[in-house]
C-alpha cells in the first residue's frame, strides 16, 4: 500500500517517499522506484539553508555599499550573507536592507546608549548637576565642576548645556 506520510527529511511524490536534498544542495530529479533523489550543490553566490526539494538555490544577499551596507558575514552554500552598516550608521530594519546615520545627542542631552550596527543612539536629558555642550553620538553628560576642589569659588552656576564657571577666592563682588 502506498505511504500517505513520510519520515523526517523525506517528501512524498508519486506515492513514494523520496529523500530531501540537504542544505547547500538543490533538487535535480525526484527519486524513483529504482533511483535515489538526485541533488546538486548550489553554485557560487547561492545558498539553501534547509533540507529541501527546491529546484533553484537562493541568491546571496548583496550588501550594497551605496546604501551604506557592508558584509558582516560572508554567505556559504548553506547560509545567506549577513549585511551590516558602515561605521557611524545603523540598519533601518531587522533585515538590514539599508542604513541611516547614527543620531547625535544635542547640547543639553547625553548619550544613554551608544548606537550599534542595528540600533540608533539613545539620548537622555542631562539632569541638574550635569551638562553637555556638544552634539555627539558618543558623549555622556558631564558632572558640573566643584570649584572648591580647585581652591576656587563659583562665579556662575552651570546649566544643562554649560559647566559651572569658577574664579579666584578673592574676587570682588
Amino acid at each position: 500500500e502506498p505511504p500517505t506520510a513520510c519520515r523526517e527529511k523525506q517528501y512524498l511524490i508519486n506515492s513514494q517517499c523520496c529523500s530531501l536534498c540537504q542544505p547547500g544542495q538543490k533538487l535535480v530529479s525526484d527519486c524513483t522506484e529504482f533511483t535515489e533523489t538526485e541533488c546538486l550543490p548550489c553554485g557560487e553566490s547561492e545558498f539553501l539553508d534547509t533540507w529541501n526539494r527546491e529546484t533553484h538555490c537562493h541568491q546571496h544577499k548583496y550588501c550594497d555599499p551605496n546604501l551604506g551596507l557592508r558584509v558582516q558575514q560572508k554567505g556559504t552554500s548553506e547560509t545567506d550573507t549577513i549585511c551590516t552598516c558602515e561605521e557611524g550608521w545603523h540598519c533601518t530594519s531587522e533585515a538590514c536592507e539599508s542604513c541611516v546615520l547614527h543620531r547625535s545627542c544635542s547640547p543639553g542631552f547625553g548619550v544613554k546608549q551608544i548606537a550599534t550596527g542595528v540600533s540608533d543612539t539613545i539620548c537622555e536629558p542631562c539632569p541638574v548637576g550635569f551638562f553637555s555642550n556638544v552634539s555627539s553620538a558618543f558623549e555622556k553628560c558631564h558632572p558640573w565642576t566643584s570649584c572648591e576642589t580647585k581652591d576656587l569659588v563659583v562665579q556662575q552656576a552651570g546649566t544643562n548645556k554649560t559647566d559651572v564657571v569658577c574664579g579666584p577666592q578673592d574676587r570682588l563682588r
Partner: antibody, heavy 121, light 113 residues
Framework: QVQLQQSGAELMKPGASVKISCKAT????????IEWVKQRPGHGLEWIGE????????NYNENFKGKATFTADTSSNTAYMQLSSLTSEDSAVYFC??????????????WGQGTSVTVSS | DIVMSQSPSSLAVSVGEKVTMSCKSS????????????LAWYQQKPGQSPKLLIY???IRESGVPDRFTGSGSGTDFTLTISSVKAEDLAVYYC?????????FGGGTKVEIK
C-alpha cells in the same frame, strides 16, 4: 544647626511691590541654592525659582519671570525675593528652602517658616 | 515641563493601617549616568512648612521614622507608611528635581478616621 528665618506677614495694595527676606544660619550660605516656593490654598506647591548666593546665578520658572526677582547678600547670609505689580493672584504663603549644592543639585532639605502675603485694596 | 501626578488626592485611614500613595512623572526621572531617580517626598502638616521625608526616591532623610518608605523608578513612584500614627495627618507631596522648572505633584491628603 541649619535654619532659615523668613520675614513677617505682609498686607499689600494691588500694584505695589513686596520684598521678602530669608536669613540662613548653620551652613555655608554661598554654596547651596536658595529655593523659593509659592503656596496658595487649594493650589499645592509651586516652584518660583532659585538663587545661588555665591555667584548671584538664578533660575526662574517661566511663569514667574517678570514677577519675582531674587537677590542675595553673602555678608548677612540673607536671600531676598521681590514680587512686583501685585494682584490678588499673588496672595499666598511664600517659602524659602535650602536646595542642593551648586554643583550637584538635590532636594529641598530645610525650609523657612513661610511668609504670608495678602494683596487687598 | 515635567508633570507630576499624585493619587489618590485624599484618603482616610485608621491608626495602625498601611498607607500607599502614588506619584507619576510625565518623563523618566532616572538618570542612567548615576542610576539615581531625581524624586523627593515631602510632608506638610496643617499650618506648618513642608518637611523633606525622602530623596533620591528611596533614601530616608535623617530623623524620619522608618515607617516611611519611598520606592519606584523611572516614572512610577510610591510612598508607603507601614503603620499610620495620628501625627501622620498631613498632605504629602512628591517633587522632581531632574530638570527645570522643578515641579510638585498636587499632593495626597492623609486623614485619620
Amino acid at each position: 544647626q541649619v535654619q532659615l528665618q523668613q520675614s513677617g506677614a505682609e498686607l499689600m495694595k494691588p500694584g505695589a511691590s513686596v520684598k521678602i527676606s530669608c536669613k540662613a544660619t548653620g551652613y555655608t550660605f554661598s554654596t547651596y541654592w536658595i529655593e523659593w516656593v509659592k503656596q496658595r490654598p487649594g493650589h499645592g506647591l509651586e516652584w518660583i525659582g532659585e538663587i545661588l548666593p555665591g555667584s548671584g546665578s538664578t533660575n526662574y520658572n517661566e511663569n514667574f519671570k517678570g514677577k519675582a526677582t531674587f537677590t542675595a547678600d553673602t555678608s548677612s547670609n540673607t536671600a531676598y525675593m521681590q514680587l512686583s505689580s501685585l494682584t490678588s493672584e499673588d496672595s499666598a504663603v511664600y517659602f524659602c528652602a535650602r536646595g542642593g549644592l551648586y554643583y550637584y543639585g538635590g532636594a529641598m532639605d530645610y525650609w523657612g517658616q513661610g511668609t504670608s502675603v495678602t494683596v487687598s485694596s | 515641563d515635567i508633570v507630576m501626578s499624585q493619587s489618590p488626592s485624599s484618603l482616610a485611614v485608621s491608626v495602625g493601617e498601611k498607607v500607599t500613595m502614588s506619584c507619576k512623572s510625565s518623563q523618566s526621572l532616572l538618570y542612567s549616568g548615576n542610576q539615581k531617580n531625581y524624586l523627593a517626598w515631602y510632608q506638610q502638616k496643617p499650618g506648618q512648612s513642608p518637611k523633606l521625608l525622602i530623596y533620591w526616591a528611596s533614601i530616608r532623610e535623617s530623623g524620619v521614622p522608618d515607617r516611611f518608605t519611598g520606592s519606584g523608578s523611572g516614572t512610577d513612584f510610591t510612598l508607603t507608611i507601614s503603620s499610620v500614627k495620628a501625627e501622620d495627618l498631613a498632605v504629602y507631596y512628591c517633587q522632581q528635581y531632574y530638570s527645570y522648572p522643578y515641579t510638585f505633584g498636587g499632593g495626597t491628603k492623609v486623614e485619620i478616621k
